[in-house]
Amino acid sequence: AASCRETCCPVGPSGLRCTRAGTLNTLRGLRGAGNLTELYVENQRDLQRLEFEDLQGLGELRSLTIVKSGLRFVAPDAFHFTPRLSHLNLSSNALESLSWKTVQGLSLQDLTLSGNPLHCSCALLWLQRWEQEDLCGVYTQKLQGSGSGDQFLPLGHNNSCGVPSVKIQMPNDSVEVGDDVFLQCQVEGQALQQADWILTELEGTATMKKSGDLPSLGLTLVNVTSDLNKKNVTCWAENDVGRAEVSVQVSVSFPASVHLGKAVEQHHWCIPFSVDGQPAPSLRWFFNGSVLNETSFIFTQFLESALTNETMRHGCLRLNQPTHVNNGNYTLLAANPYGQAAASIMAAFMDNPFEFNPEDPIPVSFSPVDTNSTSRDPVEKKDETP
């Protein structure tokens, strides 16, 4: 390495050191940088900007040091191509600010910014919070005011410093299938930069029309379907301090529906059902035409659904060790303000031991009553599934 006279010299198998004074004005297109994990830059007064594409191709970079150089500006998306970056040292440069967006999405273990003329502004509130909360090793110096000797309160006490406030106004009335729904996103805050809707969950649930601009964005959902239920409609906004977003769900009313499946024997017995409807329907079971009162031996158990974005609920009428007295017709009635539905199924769990054909031979036993009984051991699973 001592004999290297290039602008940048390799260090170990995946490091690069650029310390020859005044030889670099950009990091774009560093040679052999493909699997670089460490880049050290020093004494480069002409290196003044770090832009979006400057670190393209450095996907493996873990540590970046640019010190004692002329860096004045780091683009908010400068580290887009280095998602694995965990150590960032930009000390002793000419940075007056650094956007929160620059480090967003990175898992930084330490960030060093000492020796920069950082100006006390709302744009650096995120940095002060990191320091206060020890979110990673942050090394800076006291933030400077614009005038000499000015005593600045910590930024957190400056009430005008804050992320935007975002609120979504929704219709108060209930929404039904086929309706048009207008949502309004109201944004308040200092130095608002941009705002928009996130509508990725809404594909196929309605036609969407955006309108308006900061500080009030409109969204019309045309001809909504019941699939819109449980889907997030999100509005976000950004300023110097950070990003805020808020989500709402539009509730689209529709009538109850119900489906019953054939009884299946698991550890216990289960009569599977699916119910849908908005609002969520109330359920009532009937056995042979009479109301079935649920107990710890016969009760409704909903299945935990991995899908939280749908209104349909699945479950079981669970029967613990049912006997012949439980054989019969089971009906599930589901009802909500928009309608009701019912489904029935016959279930036979066990033959009646007291029913016999008079022509069958009657068994006669001369041996004493057998007290031995096969003992069945249900195994309780580790996760305590009932």
Partner: antibody, heavy 117, light 109 residues
Framework: QVQLQQPGVELVKPGASVKLSCKTS????????MHWVKQRPGQGLEWIGE????????NYNEKFKNKATLTVDKSSSTAYMQLTSLTSEDSAIYYC??????????WGQGTTLTVSS | QAVVTQESALTTSPGETVTLTCRSS?????????ANWVQEKPDHLFTGLIG???NRAPGVPARFSGSLIGDKAALTITGAQTEDEAIYFC?????????FGGGTRLTVL
């Protein structure tokens, strides 16, 4: 492991009310029914009622319908039994017991309730 | 309300087999009664042993078994041990409520 924790002792005055607790751990609280049982010296065990922790559905022994109210707090995985208008007849040990499949399998250690002026 | 009757006390010796029974005032005990057997040891330590007549609860030793003998539910301890000395309660389910027996005090001498 499955645990049902009950306070050891409650001392209350006649005519008052008391809320007994049964804090659970080691299993998914909302998947099971919880039962409450009364034990008086020389009088064996009496079943008070049951509650489904998932939705608060209850069934009571007729004898205790106007005496006991069963509730659950899912956030703390705790079952409760409130007893009202207490008299000396309510002095007893009260147990919570978990229902799994066809078993009253796990029991609390009981709360000794003394009703005395 | 139904009454459930058990032997008030039984004595056995270590290694012996002993059977405790549980009778219902409403007639024969059936599978619909989901007969449970619960053990009480000193300091009010209750443990569920048997449920649904003959299902052993997880972790219960195999020497405990449940059955129907005639019109009664039964708990059999095959090869009793000194630590089995306890009070054993039978509980029967009647459609929507449990009724407990008075308990059998088992002494293992």
């Amino acid at each position: 492991q499955v645990q049902l924790q009950q306070p050891g002792v409650e001392l209350v005055k006649p005519g008052a009310s008391v809320k007994l607790s049964c804090k659970t751990s080691g299993y998914t609280f909302t998947s099971y029914w919880m039962h409450w049982v009364k034990q008086r010296p020389g009088q064996g065990l009496e079943w008070i009622g049951e509650i489904y922790s998932s939705n608060g559905l209850t069934n009571y022994n007729e004898k205790f319908k106007n005496k006991a109210t069963l509730t659950v707090d899912k956030s703390s995985s705790t079952a409760y039994m409130q007893l009202t208008s207490l008299t000396s007849e309510d002095s007893a040990i009260y147990y919570c017991a978990r229902h799994w499949y066809v078993f009253l399998d796990h029991w609390g250690q009981g709360t000794t309730l003394t009703v005395s002026s | 309300q139904a009454v459930v009757t058990q032997e008030s006390a039984l004595t056995t010796s270590p290694g012996e087999t002993v059977t405790l029974t549980c009778r219902s005032s409403t007639g024969a005990v059936t599978t619909s009664n989901h007969a449970n057997w619960v053990q009480e040891k000193p300091d009010h330590l209750f443990t569920g042993l048997i449920g649904g007549i003959n299902n052993r609860a997880p972790g219960v030793p195999a020497r405990f078994s449940g059955s129907l003998i005639g019109d009664k539910a039964a708990l059999t301890i095959t090869g009793a041990q000194t630590e089995d000395e306890a009070i054993y309660f039978c509980a029967l389910w009647y459609s929507n409520h449990w009724v407990f027996g008075g308990g059998t005090r088992l002494t293992v001498l």
